[in-house]
Structure formats: structure tokens, C-alpha cells
């Protein structure tokens, strides 16, 4: 594929990545799939500066990110190492709370109204943020 050198229309460029901020809500899996269909992934937060950038754009609204523990340990969707990476959980989180009555625990991470992270039921219809890196090979065939 060809290299992407600028962000698609309606995406925001920041530090060699492109971000798209939803204005509607989806379950985590649907949000994840939406980003994949855009040749992107749910946002992966790797630094305090990226945290601030995303926080600035989403405002005080629950918003999915690309972090989950549906298969056991916490994992970032792009393979970024969770254990050694940046974290910004709310106090006492993640807690895998079962008391919501919706079945199971809480396996998907989201930005809360103050920007810090919480784990929640993956079926909740939250907004989401997609991210794709500039300079990576896109799936589009090169123009001949």
C-alpha cells in the first residue's frame, strides 16, 4: 500500500497521528470495528501529552479508548505494552465491578468526565476516538 502523509478529511492531526472524534455512541466492539474499517484503531494513549490532547477534544464525556481486558490481562489494541506504558486510571480503578446487574464484569476502558480512565461494561454506548499513524502503509492500492 501507499504511505499516508496527511490526515483524511474531518480527522485531526497531532504528533504524526490522525484522530477522529465521534459524536454518537456505540458499544466498544462496534466502535473498535468502526475504526478498523477506517484503517485505524481505537485511540491508544501513550503519554501525558497525548492524554491531554484527547481530553481537550472530547470534553467531559464518557469515551471509549483502545484498551480492554476481555481475554484476561489489560491490552492495548495496537499491541502497545500495557504494564510499562502510560496509565491514568481513576482512584480504585479498574475494579471489574459486577454490581451493575448487566452480567459479567467490566472489561473495556473509557475516558470519564474528568479525563481519567475507568473500566466499564463493554456494551455501553459511549462515544469513541479512532487513531491512525501517519507514514504507515495504508490499505488503499497505489495509484498507477
Amino acid at each position: 500500500g501507499s504511505e499516508r502523509t496527511c490526515c483524511p478529511v474531518n480527522w485531526v492531526e497531532h504528533e504524526r497521528s490522525c484522530y477522529w472524534f465521534s459524536r454518537s455512541g456505540k458499544a466498544w466492539a462496534d466502535a473498535d470495528n468502526y475504526c478498523r474499517l477506517e484503517d485505524a484503531h481505537l485511540v491508544v494513549v501513550t503519554s501525558w501529552e497525548e492524554q491531554k490532547f484527547v481530553q481537550h477534544h472530547i470534553g467531559p464525556v464518557n469515551t471509549w479508548m483502545g484498551l480492554h481486558d476481555q481475554n484476561g490481562p489489560w491490552k492495548w489494541v495496537d499491541g502497545t505494552d500495557y504494564e510499562t506504558g502510560f496509565k491514568n486510571w481513576r482512584p480504585e480503578q479498574p475494579d471489574d465491578w459486577y454490581g451493575h446487574g448487566l452480567g459479567g464484569g467490566e472489561d473495556c476502558a473509557h475516558f470519564t468526565d474528568d479525563g481519567r480512565w475507568n473500566d466499564d461494561v463493554c456494551q455501553r454506548p459511549y462515544r469513541w476516538v479512532c487513531e491512525t499513524e501517519l507514514d504507515k502503509a495504508s490499505q488503499e492500492p497505489p495509484l498507477l
Partner: antibody, heavy 122, light 107 residues
């Protein structure tokens, strides 16, 4: 009301140590990153250090790295600055300041203490 | 380190004047710039964050603009209580750095 009150300043000889404290009230201290900023007499502002809301990370200005240690006790709503191997150029008013944003990020300083004077002189 | 350069270092103005202070970063800092006002013997006060967002309680005569490397603080109509020193500060990367300050004096 939201308030920060520094204490612990004074006159100290070069090479000696001093610990500053900053007592916070009127807000959820454990949610905010906290900073120390200093201002030498007649000079501008210089950022010294920051500590994340939960104490998990700390960053320092090069001028104090290895000599100063920032810490916090969220159960006491108090921020500290341990200053070792003090030099004449550390003479300044030291302010503690709250970050505008909660959590593990840094932006602007929206709440400031009144400052405490540290004089390093023989 | 990111250097922040403010200009002018001082400005003489009269009540009612429009005052513009500029701040230039040595490298791009996106919108991560704040402006403060400081009066003698007092702690600084936050005026503007994220380059153009007005801090709660700050009069509307203060405004900020810019992104990347060039930023401005504008006081649309100078009031007697605005005579003070103004500082910019970048929050893009550590170490956080301030500009050298701009003193707004009475003409």
C-alpha cells in the same frame, strides 16, 4: 474555599537542606497533579517539579535534578519539596501550584499558594 | 528544552489602550500555552490556557490566540488593575518553561 498554603522557608547555609510543605484545602487534592514553581528576587518564574495526582510519576527541572525531591501525602492533603545541597542560586520565593487538569497530565497552574521565601546564604 | 521568548519586555500604556504581548516558542507546542498575570509581591494568576481559553472569572477584555510557535495575549481596553507583569508558559513537554515576562507600566 480552594487554598494552598506553603511553609518551611527560611535562611539556610549553602550545602544544607530544607523541606517545604504545601497544605491544600477546598478541593480533592488526590485528583490533581501538583507543581513547585520558584521566582528569584527580581526575576521571572521558573518551574521546578511536578508530581502526578497519585504520586506515580515525578519530573524535575535540570537545575534541581538529583538535589530536590517532590512528594505528596494524599491522606494529609499535603505536598512537599525536599531540597538538599542548596546553592545560592536556589534563593527564591517558592510557590506550590495546582494543575488545571486532574490525573496524569500537565497543563496550566490554576491555583497558587502565597509563596514561601528560601534564602541560601553563608 | 523549549525556549519561550516574550516581547516586548516592557510596554508603557494608558488606561483604555489596546495592548498586545507576543510569545514565541523555539519549537512547535500546538496549543499548549498559558498566560499569567503577576502583581508585585503576589502569586501569579492564570488568565488563559490552551492558547485561547479564558480562565473562569477572568474579564473578557483578555484574549489569547495562536498555535504552533507564535502566540499573542491581547488586552482590548487596559484598566487600572491590569498594570502588572505577564508571563507565558508552555505545557507541551518537560521541563515546563516560562517566557521572561512583559511588564505593563503606566504611561
Amino acid at each position: 474555599q480552594v487554598q494552598l498554603v506553603e511553609s518551611g522557608g527560611g535562611v539556610v547555609q549553602p550545602g544544607r537542606s530544607l523541606r517545604l510543605s504545601c497544605a491544600a484545602s477546598g478541593f480533592t487534592f488526590s485528583s490533581y497533579g501538583m507543581h513547585w514553581v520558584r521566582q528569584a528576587p527580581g526575576k521571572g518564574l521558573e518551574w521546578v517539579a511536578v508530581i502526578w495526582y497519585d504520586g506515580s510519576d515525578k519530573y524535575y527541572a535540570d537545575s534541581v535534578k538529583g538535589r530536590f525531591t517532590i512528594s505528596r501525602d494524599n491522606s494529609k492533603n499535603t505536598l512537599y519539596l525536599q531540597m538538599n545541597s542548596l546553592r545560592a542560586e536556589d534563593t527564591a520565593v517558592y510557590y506550590c501550584a495546582r494543575d488545571r487538569l486532574v490525573g496524569a497530565t500537565v497543563d496550566a497552574f490554576d491555583i497558587w499558594g502565597q509563596g514561601t521565601m528560601v534564602t541560601v546564604s553563608s | 528544552d523549549i525556549q519561550m521568548t516574550q516581547s516586548p519586555s516592557s510596554v508603557s500604556a494608558s488606561v483604555g489602550d489596546r495592548v498586545i504581548i507576543t510569545c514565541r516558542a523555539s519549537q512547535g507546542i500546538s496549543i499548549w500555552l498559558a498566560w499569567y498575570q503577576q502583581k508585585p509581591g503576589k502569586a501569579p494568576k492564570l488568565l488563559i490556557y490552551a492558547a485561547s481559553s479564558l480562565q473562569s472569572g477572568v474579564p473578557l477584555r483578555f484574549s489569547g490566540s495562536g498555535s504552533g510557535t507564535d502566540f499573542t495575549l491581547t488586552i482590548s481596553s487596559l484598566q487600572p488593575e491590569d498594570f502588572a507583569t505577564y508571563y507565558c508558559q508552555q505545557a507541551k513537554s518537560f521541563p515546563l518553561t516560562f517566557g521572561g515576562g512583559t511588564k505593563v507600566e503606566i504611561k
